[in-house]
Amino acid sequence: QVPPQYPPIQSIRVQFTRCENEKGCIITSPSKDETMKVQDNSIIINCDGFYLISLKGYFSEELSLSLYYRKGRGPLFSLSKVTSVDSIGVAYLAFKDKVYFNVTTHSTSYKDIQVNGGELILIHQNPGGFCAY
Amino acid sequence: QVPPQYPPIQSIRVQFTRCENEKGCIITSPSKDETMKVQDNSIIINCDGFYLISLKGYFSEELSLSLYYRKGRGPLFSLSKVTSVDSIGVAYLAFKDKVYFNVTTHSTSYKDIQVNGGELILIHQNPGGFCAY
Amino acid sequence: QVPPQYPPIQSIRVQFTRCENEKGCIITSPSKDETMKVQDNSIIINCDGFYLISLKGYFSEELSLSLYYRKGRGPLFSLSKVTSVDSIGVAYLAFKDKVYFNVTTHSTSYKDIQVNGGELILIHQNPGGFCAY
């Protein structure tokens, strides 16, 4: 008898090379075979459970950056007046949540902020829980 | 043939809104369907393996806080003279371990410390290993 | 029918008590039943996917320490002029990668650096993905 295989874990790595003031960061998924999807510049959550979240990036200007998952809820991350980020967190997310950026800069002298090494990773920690596809 | 499902991962999120000097923090599990249990103000470990541990909170007074798992062993986290915590760690825990707080304050003018956003998350990282229920 | 068990997750905890200038840290695996292996002072990656990485240690001298996984790629961790480390990260690693230390000290008066509590943990986060053994 063949031992059972793991179904694929819900996870995604998105990259971002540009953020816009009063908007967010433009995210792209470099891999076609990710188990989670990007839609309207947000990562779509289909499975309830804890997620390991890693956020990295080096910014061309000082900015304030927040990562949200649901309207009316506090941010997953919130960084004020930084030029880089390297943070890890754990959060409980649920079906219908959407993970997206909000960015504020403190100058009007530039249109956008360049990002080197911009990377956001989400990894589901509770396979076997509720998922809706 | 139905593809195999993951058995539920051992994980828990507990909240704490109050810590007592020379004692610990009073933890409660907001969800009834957690796969790990709270007993005598401690989280009970049934499964051997690595655990991802997330600890957050904002305290009404400066305190020193440690998170222990076994008598005679060093703490999982140890924070000295802080008013907030936002930490992530990885530790190997085993059956019979119990995860609990110890708190010390540096003033005699109050008994209790109020906590906003007090949250402790444990997520087992080695399903398939030894568990005793 | 017996519910399916998880196959063991790829994970390892190595310890290091000594680092050598211009070289690395001598790593040993205290447990015989780890699911990952150490070879030539490197941790061998057999499975593609995200890894949770925890690095801790207290050093007898100030040093600069990097943790690499592939020639020509940036480090997983890079710490400059530190006497301790307690870091967590997430990285995508793949078959044929090797995780190893590089250390530089800033004194010629000693060859070896002693390490207390030196620990490196890797935990695979994408079971079910590609593995080569």
């Epitope: 200007e61 530039y110 | - | 480090p75």
Partner: antibody, heavy 118, light 106 residues
């Protein structure tokens, strides 16, 4: 005063290797991203590689990917460019640059000449 | 990859305005930086974020950027402004330079 001093340029044969160094002073090295920019004789500027403040993020122009490696030693205030499998078209003056606002190349060294010829 | 197009050379009469252009697809949506390189010297930043001047750069240098063209303007060119001028942008974590324009002051 900000100073960037490159060294390591030389005459090398095709397929050879070199390591360029850039020692900096006058600013807190580990607070700034760095880049290498090159200029072939009589030609324009070409960006070569970028490295973040801590060395964990790097990027390269397509022409050098897999052959060049940028690195830094913050303790020694030194930026490096390891060059392998050299080609004649890699002949150029290589400038070390400090990144400023907007990832501009705010300060430049005087350059070091790499000549690839058989 | 993103391409920036500059005219190889441009002549200007002493004390007259000089306009150096840099073309790129929808370049107006990007931040453009300009560098001056005098003969035998390393380049130097003269304009950043389309139109901002670093400390020490004379007021006669200005910049603009919209549509598919960014422009560096020298309001009254001096002999010391004879040099090569390069535009630069970042695109997807990769930096791109224009081919450069050699400005001759007559």
């Amino acid at each position: 005063e900000v100073q960037l001093v490159e060294s390591g340029g030389d005459l090398v044969k095709p397929e050879g290797s070199l390591r360029l160094s850039c020692v900096v002073s006058g600013f807190t090295f580990n607070n700034y991203g760095m880049s290498w920019v090159r200029q072939a004789p009589g030609k324009g500027l070409q960006w070569v590689a970028y490295i973040s403040i801590d060395g964990r993020s790097t990027s390269y122009t397509d022409a050098v990917k897999g052959r060049f490696t940028i690195s830094r030693d913050n303790a020694k205030n030194t930026l490096y460019l390891h060059i392998n499998s050299l080609r004649t078209e890699d002949t150029a003056v290589y400038y070390c640059t400090k990144l400023g606002r907007g990832f501009t190349f705010g300060y430049w060294g005087q350059g070091t000449l790499v000549t690839v010829s058989s | 990859s993103y391409v920036l197009t500059q005219l190889p050379s441009k002549n200007v009469t002493l004390k007259q305005p000089a306009h150096i252009t840099c073309g790129g697809d929808n370049i107006g949506s990007k931040s453009v930086h300009w560098y001056q390189q005098k003969l035998g010297q390393a380049p130097a930043l003269i304009i950043y974020y389309d139109s901002s001047r670093p400390t020490g750069i004379p007021e006669r240098f200005s910049g603009a950027n919209s549509g598919n063209t960014a422009t560096l303007t020298i309001s009254g060119a001096l002999a010391e402004d004879e040099a090569d001028y390069y535009c630069q942008v970042w695109d997807s974590s990769v930096s791109v330079f224009g081919g450069g324009t050699h400005l001759t002051v007559l």
